[in-house]
């Protein structure tokens, strides 16, 4: 029951997280005009990953897309890439995790397969969350750098007569949405990985232990306590779960069919 709850909660948390990552990626307010310690303007500028917008006091808002690809800063391209990879991995993870849910029965799918799928989706959620957090953090770092650079030469005087105030940008709402969403996706992924361990419990076989009342020797047959690593020799006994303590090689090789993402 606890495993089902952990898996279900992990799925829901990841779902909310990925929805948040998608929302953050689409939002226009990644960076917003810094209003602190600046002259009050009748224009408010804000920028997203895909377009920049200007909201006038009049009520009009005008947004213009970044129609160039090569002319954009490499950092912005990197952030876009990280967010998209996060969304794609998260979406695939959601798809896999739906079939992995213990409460959903699909044909005669065994628990070992469900455990594998749960672990796979968990890893995908973790990577997805990390991608989003990394993307948002890279953008935030870019903003901080630009902020202090523009503060250093905030007033660029023309012969000391005319002053041009540079527009400074600060953190927009999308950054906070992205951080929270990335964190939720990460937490959801960890929960899925924990649930996977519960789905594939350690198999303990108490077999053929012979007690001799008269003697002091206890005979243990070699197949007694068996760790379910998937490499066990005792394969003619009960089905061994694959999803428990698996080797690193196995964990990494399973999602290799998604390496093109």
């Amino acid at each position: 029951m606890a495993v089902t709850a952990c898996q279900g909660l992990g799925f829901v948390v990841s779902l909310i997280g990925i929805a948040g990552i998608i929302a953050a990626t689409c939002m226009d307010q990644w960076s917003t005009q810094d209003l602190y310690n600046n002259p009050v303007t009748a224009v408010f500028n804000y920028q997203g990953l895909w377009r920049s917008c200007v909201r006038e006091s009049s009520g009009f808002t005008e947004c213009r897309g970044y129609f160039t690809l090569l002319g954009l800063p490499a950092m912005l391209q990197a952030v876009r890439a990280l967010m998209i990879v996060g969304i794609v991995l998260g979406a695939i993870g959601l798809l896999v995790s739906i079939f992995a849910l213990k409460c959903i029965r699909i044909g005669s799918m065994e628990d070992s397969a469900k455990a594998n799928m749960t672990l796979t989706s968990g890893i995908m959620f973790i990577v997805s969350g990390l991608c989003a957090i990394a993307g948002v953090s890279v953008f935030a770092n870019m903003l901080v750098t630009n902020f202090w650079m523009s503060t250093a030469n905030m007033y660029t005087g023309m012969g000391g007569m005319v002053q041009t105030v540079q527009t400074r940008y600060t953190f927009g709402a999308a950054l906070f949405v992205g951080w929270v969403a990335g964190g939720l996706t990460l937490i959801g992924g960890v929960m899925m990985c924990i649930a996977c361990r519960g789905l594939a419990p350690e198999e303990t076989n108490y077999k053929a232990v012979s007690y001799h009342a008269s003697g002091h020797s206890v005979a243990y047959k070699p197949g007694g306590f068996k760790a379910s690593t998937g490499f066990g020799s005792n394969t003619k006994n009960k089905k061994i779960y694959d999803g428990g303590a698996r080797t690193e090689d196995e964990v990494q090789s399973y999602p290799s069919k998604h390496d093109y993402v």
């Epitope: 005009q33 002259p39 009050v40 303007t41 009748a42 224009v43 500028n45 920028q47 920049s52 917008c53 200007v54 006038e56 006091s57 009049s58 009520g59 009009f60 005008e62 213009r64 005319v162 002053q163 041009t164 105030v165 540079q166 527009t167």
Partner: antibody, heavy 118, light 113 residues
């Protein structure tokens, strides 16, 4: 057709109060920022106050800060300017204006005359 | 506050003549976000409220004759009337629409010779 009609002007003594109204029609009142602009006899226009479409942002000219209050009632399509502690230099024609692109004052009313005199 | 300086204060012209008037702001009115200059030109005739002619320094308001042209960027702006008509005799004001307070220039009065 956009129409702005000001009312509430008149003769008032220094230190007195007055409330101007501006009835708007012909456009979505709650979609636009609005402003009050005044023009003293034989002088240029002077911006007095601004209010955003939702009344979230409000700005005043330094000369009227603390004495004038701009407000709006979107349900009634009406803009207000409450004036107190009036001075002789507040004597002017008061216009209500609807903002347009570029924060320009795209539409103006015909104005209401406010005279502050003893 | 942003100071808007208009010159000349008055212009005496003949019909059909080309007229140019200047407006200078104490700070740049160029918004980096959309690369637009938040400067507006108005025309005011006696007994009437001002009428919007040009916004964003160079965008003509609908219904305004194309003989009116706005130009300039940053701090220096110009209003040009290619061929003055009798109905153009009025006072022309420029306005800063970027910084609060939204200040007006003192105006340029266009008079007939």
């Amino acid at each position: 057709e956009v129409k702005l009609v000001e009312s509430g002007g008149g003769l008032v003594q220094p230190g007195g109060s007055l409330k101007l109204s501006c009835a708007a029609s012909g456009f979505g009142f709650s979609d636009y920022g609005m402003a009050w602009v005044r023009q003293a006899p034989r002088k240029g226009p002077e911006w007095v106050a601004f209010i955003s479409n939702s009344a979230y942002s409000i700005y005043y000219a330094d000369t009227v800060t603390g004495r004038f209050t701009i407000s709006r009632e979107n349900a009634k399509n009406t803009l207000y300017l409450e004036m107190s502690s009036l001075r002789s230099e507040d004597t002017a024609m008061y216009y209500c204006a609807r903002l347009g692109r570029g924060n320009s004052f795209a539409y103006w009313g015909q104005g209401t005359l406010v005279t502050v005199s003893a | 506050d942003i100071v808007m300086t208009q010159s000349p204060s008055s212009l005496t012209v003949t019909a059909g003549e080309k007229v140019t008037m200047s407006c200078k702001s104490s700070q740049s009115l160029l918004n980096s976000g959309n690369q637009k200059n938040y400067l507006t030109w108005y025309q005011q005739k006696p007994g009437q409220p001002p009428k919007l002619l040009i916004y964003w320094a160079s965008t003509r308001e609908s219904g305004v004759p194309d003989r009116f042209t706005g130009s300039g960027s940053g701090t220096d702006f110009t209003l040009t009337i290619s061929s003055v008509q009798a109905e153009d005799l009025a006072v022309y004001y420029c306005q800063n629409n970027y910084y609060y307070p939204l200040t007006f220039g003192a105006g340029t009065k266009l008079e007939l010779k």
